[in-house]
Amino acid sequence: IPVIEPSVPELVVKPGATVTLRCVGNGSVEWDGPPSPHWTLYSDGSSSILSTNNATFQNTGTYRCTEPGDPLGGSAAIHLYVKDPARPWNVLAQEVVVFEDQDALLPCLLTDPVLEAGVSLVRVRGRPLMRHTNYSFSPWHGFTIHRAKFIQSQDYQCSALMGGRKVMSISIRLKVQKVIPGPPALTLVPAELVRIRGEAAQIVCSASSVDVNFDVFLQHNNTKLAIPQQSDFHNNRYQKVLTLNLDQVDFQHAGNYSCVASNVQGKHSTSMFFRVVESAYLNLSSEQNLIQEVTVGEGLNLKVMVEAYPGLQGFNWTYLGPFSDHQPEPKLANATTKDTYRHTFTLSLPRLKPSEAGRYSFLARNPGGWRALTFELTLRYPPEVSVIWTFINGSGTLLCAASGYPQPNVTWLQCSGHTDRCDEAQVLQVWDDPYPEVLSQEPFHKVTVQSLLTVETLEHNQTYECRAHNSVGSGSWAFIPISAGAHTHPPDEFLFTP
């Protein structure tokens, strides 16, 4: 650590005195203090001499000697008072800038330590300090306003009592800056805009910040717009608003609009798109397939996306048949607005019944006209099977009828013994019928197919089973010949309740 001679913490001299401050260190040393012309400096290796042969009140201050090469950064300091009876203050600054809640040091250095008891801080023109101004004084450094507030941005003077009268320093302007957390907050409304050519439009760009020093502008396709700015202050924030009013929009007004605000912390921007159209429009679409298949008893939500300008004047869901004249319950229809010009309409169909298959249409209207989007809903059913014994063209024939949706496939099994259902161990023969005869196939209904198995002689200790399956499930019917005739068995487990 460097050493200063004289080795005293402070030195008091009269104006005109000779002052010599010598600093010695291990390596090269340098002096630091308030810049002043009233010194001469002589450096010689590891020592440096700061001297004046005509000290003035302006030499009052703290002088620090440091050793730049010292990794520990040690320093020594001495405070010099030049006590000028006419000049109680040496003011080191015209202005002090701090952030809110920082301590603000107003550097009025007292030139005579004896005057410390009679010092005070005032605002210029003798005005008292604002209430709640908490300050302290150090003869070496000046007045400190603790946790300075924005409202304390004022011009201050330091006052000392000399021979019964107050002597003021030159003034110091304190600027307390608000702590700016980031770039200004922005709003640009609307977020999206559509207008028909010739209509009026308004776009509002506004920015706010705790500090008044920020800029805001609105640009259209990268061209800055010259718009008068409205300024306001409320909720402890400064607000700047730019309003673009267009009486009759045309296609050249369309495009991207950006609201941009900047301050010392950086820049924020937000954008919106303005569409100008020739006439009203109404577009219906769905992300779903318009042809829907759902298993009976399950639920389905039908969703339609609507894009429209101007807004909708009416809309509804309609059931177009074919089963009944019932209409969807209003409580099952739901509308959500994604944004100003886009909406989603949902029809919920829970636990679908056979009579609810068919066409569902969403209709919407605006000044551009009517539009409709129709869904076709087909219900899927597992197969239902029945077998009868009959003679066709004199031949004994087992006739299997299966109905379900999608169209069932049919397989015949012959197995030993009497059983409700053939299992693998019992199976004697298997016949697949790749092309059963379609008896009925109407839209939104089950498909009924018929398969024939010609049997020359019925084996009495055997079972004939017709199995049908589709993507939903399977059904079967066992036929057991008995001496007195034929006996048929639907499987016990088969129970269908939609």
Partner: antibody
Framework: QVQLQESGPGLVKPSETLSLTCTVS????????WSWIRQPAGKGLEWIGR???????KYNPSLKSRVAMSVDTSKNQFSLKLSSVTAADTAVYYC???????????WGQGTLVTVSS | QSVLTQPPSASGTPGQRVTISCSGS????????VTWYQQLPGTAPKLLIY???QRPSGVPDRFSGSKSGTSASLAISGLQSEDEADYYC???????????FGGGTKLTVL
């Protein structure tokens, strides 16, 4: 070794505000006085003002109404703002450390700021 | 217009002695010490002389300064080609509470 580096936009439009930052490295910004000096092309040097780490500032009276300085000790930086600029403010702007006798012992390399529309 | 006055140019041949003058007023050079800076082309100024005649470490003793009344001068002896630069005088100005500068002298080594 103390080093100073100026940064900021090289082009400013008339009537706007010129903003520059000086970053100090190789030493602490604390306990020293830091100045801004400018030099118009082919002309002499002009002292703009100085700032101390406590926020104490002295400005050149000829520029005082348009100048603002600030210091950020946590970033080892100090800043200059010059408002309502005109073409006459086009210059190389230097930041420098001001020694106890009022001379400048460490300088930044300078940054050219042009005021033009 | 600079506060301190310097000749715009000066020249000399290698090995020669060249002097650059700087004049001011009682509020600057008359009552305060003078500093000289050297600015090589395309670089920042560099401290050359302070307190009228003191050289920082690393500055050759070919450079010397003096002051008399409200004027000061910089002398360069044994002129070398690397001395070709702009030279600025500066002094504290009491009315400014800060430094003022001369307009600079362009030294050409012929």
């Amino acid at each position: 070794q103390v080093q100073l580096q100026e940064s900021g936009p090289g082009l400013v439009k008339p009537s706007e505000t010129l903003s520059l930052t000086c970053t100090v490295s190789g030493g602490s910004i604390s306990s020293y006085y830091w100045s801004w000096i400018r030099q118009p092309a082919g002309k002499g040097l002009e002292w703009i003002g100085r700032i101390y780490t406590s926020g104490s500032i002295k400005y050149n009276p000829s520029l005082k109404s348009r100048v603002a300085m600030s210091v950020d000790t946590s970033k080892n930086q100090f800043s200059l703002k010059l408002s309502s600029v005109t073409a006459a403010d086009t210059a190389v702007y230097y930041c420098a450390r001001e020694g106890i006798l009022g001379y400048f012992d460490y300088w930044g390399q300078g940054t050219l700021v042009t005021v033009s529309s | 217009q600079s506060v301190l006055t310097q000749p715009p140019s000066a020249s000399g041949t290698p090995g020669q002695r060249v002097t650059i003058s700087c004049s001011g007023s009682s509020s600057n050079i008359g009552s305060n010490t003078v500093t000289w800076y050297q600015q090589l082309p395309g670089t920042a100024p560099k401290l050359l002389i302070y307190s009228n005649n003191q050289r920082p470490s690393g500055v050759p003793d070919r450079f010397s300064g003096s002051k008399s009344g409200t004027s000061a001068s910089l002398a360069i002896s044994g002129l070398q080609s690397e001395d070709e630069a702009d030279y600025y005088c500066a002094a504290w100005d009491d009315s400014l509470s800060g430094p003022v500068f001369g307009g600079g002298t362009k030294l050409t080594v012929l």
